[in-house]
Amino acid sequence: AGVFELQIHSFGPGPGPGAPRSPCSARLPCRLFFRVCLKPGLSEEAAESPCALGAALSARGPVYTEQPGAPAPDLPLPDGLLQVPFRDAWPGTFSFIIETWREELGDQIGGPAWSLLARVAGRRRLAAGGPWARDIQRAGAWELRFSYRARCEPPAVGTACTRLCRPRSAPSRCGPGLRPCAPLEDECEAPLVCRAGCSPEHGFCEQPGECRCLEGWTGPLCTVPVSTSSCLSPRGPSSATTGCLVPGPGPCDGNPCANGGSCSETPRSFECTCPRGFYGLRCEVSGVTCADGPCFNGGLCVGGADPDSAYICHCPPGFQGSNCEKRVDRCSLQPCRNGGLCLDLGHALRCRCRAGFAGPRCEHDLDDCAGRACANGGTCVEGGGAHRCSCALGFGGRDCRERADPCAARPCAHGGRCYAHFSGLVCACAPGYMGARCEFPVHPDGASALPAAPPGLRPGDPQRYL
């Protein structure tokens, strides 16, 4: 057993041109936090495969507000280390994923909003007990500097944390083949990690994970004394007749501890040592709440206001799992029509359409658009044998190559007034309308008091002119 420790030194713009925009602004102050995921071995595993060695979340960093006009500096970081405890041997070779998350603190609906800023990954060799290893990783225009190490938790020692240190049985020397434990010279190395909870005084092991008892002791963890009087049968009679204790099933048999807890026998019953994030008699209660930010990939955390109530992660499209940690293969749903090629880009789904088709899902048959391109994100629309471009906001002309007044396309619905702005446009809505483009009437026309039948489909409306 031991702990993998990660220290983040800095997160900020990398060298070279194209410095990233600050992730925070005066309107949307934010703070960073980090997630680390560890997997054993050097295999190229998918990002969504389980963090078999463990995972950890950092605390939230200090709130940061961008200074207008200033370049994005290194961003303020959370205090402390990220610690990932591991129960078994340290594998020596491991893969890691470190994610930098942004928590927006603006006037968010339903609490803060989380978004993934950067993800770095790598494969490394590392011996437990060694010095801190330094690393620099780049993700797009961002650069992450960090150090890491693996250390064993006493009594484990060694490069894989598989050997144990035990107090010396004799004052002068260790047993045959066993060395003193540096730096604890008064202790000796034991060659193997025995079964968790195996009595250090009365048990030993010749294979990892086993617990063999010295003479006079019994039980799965060698904690039960055996009477010296002879037993009459291989299983022994009841203790009432001869005082010979029958080793019955131990309280830790079958490991009653849930969620990776380790079981230790006690004089009366058993005791579970729970991993971080769980508690309760059998480690059955999750101590994680929504405040810990357990939902990844922008998932919405609901419930879990206190440690005794469960939380649920509502995952955004493209992610699933109890913590939104698994990416869904959205292309398996075959969303691209007309033979389009599906590309799952992670942040979005794209369809690469065959010639003659267009649209987000290749749903538009554009025979007369074949071979014709609309520039600047415009979409080609079929129209009686002639190709026409429906241009993205801010562009116009036959092929969308001309920069247009963003307000010329009348982008504000329902009589909203359009104002050109350096970042695009702003709509000032007429009374009774809401939305970025005034497209939502607060009380739609004709919605009089009930009894009013549902209006059903209305292909047009009185404001068709805008």
Epitope: I109, G359, P360, R361, E363, S390, A413, G435, A436, R437, E439, F440, P444, L457, R458, P459, G460, D461, Q463, R464, Y465, L466
Partner: nanobody, 117 residues
Framework: EVQLVESGGGLVQPGGSLTLSCAAS????????SAWYRQAPGKKRELVAG???????VYIDSVKGRFTISRDNAKNSVYLQMNSLRAEDTAVYYC???????????WGQGTLVTVSS
């Protein structure tokens, strides 16, 4: 022509949750501004939540922090996740779409949500 079909309504206890779904035919929801409206007995239909083509959202004050509107372009659907429901949320909920291509409004037929113990 855009057709909208709502589902997910029903009877739920106060404090409970429901998710309403609205499936759009033909046109992709990424080209539509979509919203959920509701009409309680004896009251005017009112906007509950809306999501614009750029993903920005609006909510009325009485549902902020409890309701979340979202859309899945791949499934051509819009959703309303309703948590901590109250008796005053009882209404017929309508899906709405505003087409920027035709500058037209479209409505679904409505789905009834009843919050009662």
């Amino acid at each position: 022509e855009v057709q909208l079909v709502e589902s997910g309504g029903g009877l739920v206890q106060p404090g409970g949750s429901l998710t309403l779904s609205c499936a759009a035919s033909e046109s992709s929801v990424s080209f539509l501004s979509s919203a959920w409206y509701r009409q309680a007995p004896g009251k005017k239909r009112e906007l509950v939540a809306g999501i614009s083509t750029d993903g920005s959202t609006v909510y009325i004050d009485s549902v902020k922090g409890r309701f979340t509107i979202s859309r899945d372009n791949a499934k051509n659907s819009v959703y309303l996740q309703m948590n901590s429901l109250r008796a005053e949320d009882t209404a017929v909920y309508y899906c709405y779409a505003y087409s920027w291509t035709t500058r037209s409004r479209y409505w679904g037929q409505g789905t009834l949500v009843t919050v009662s113990s």
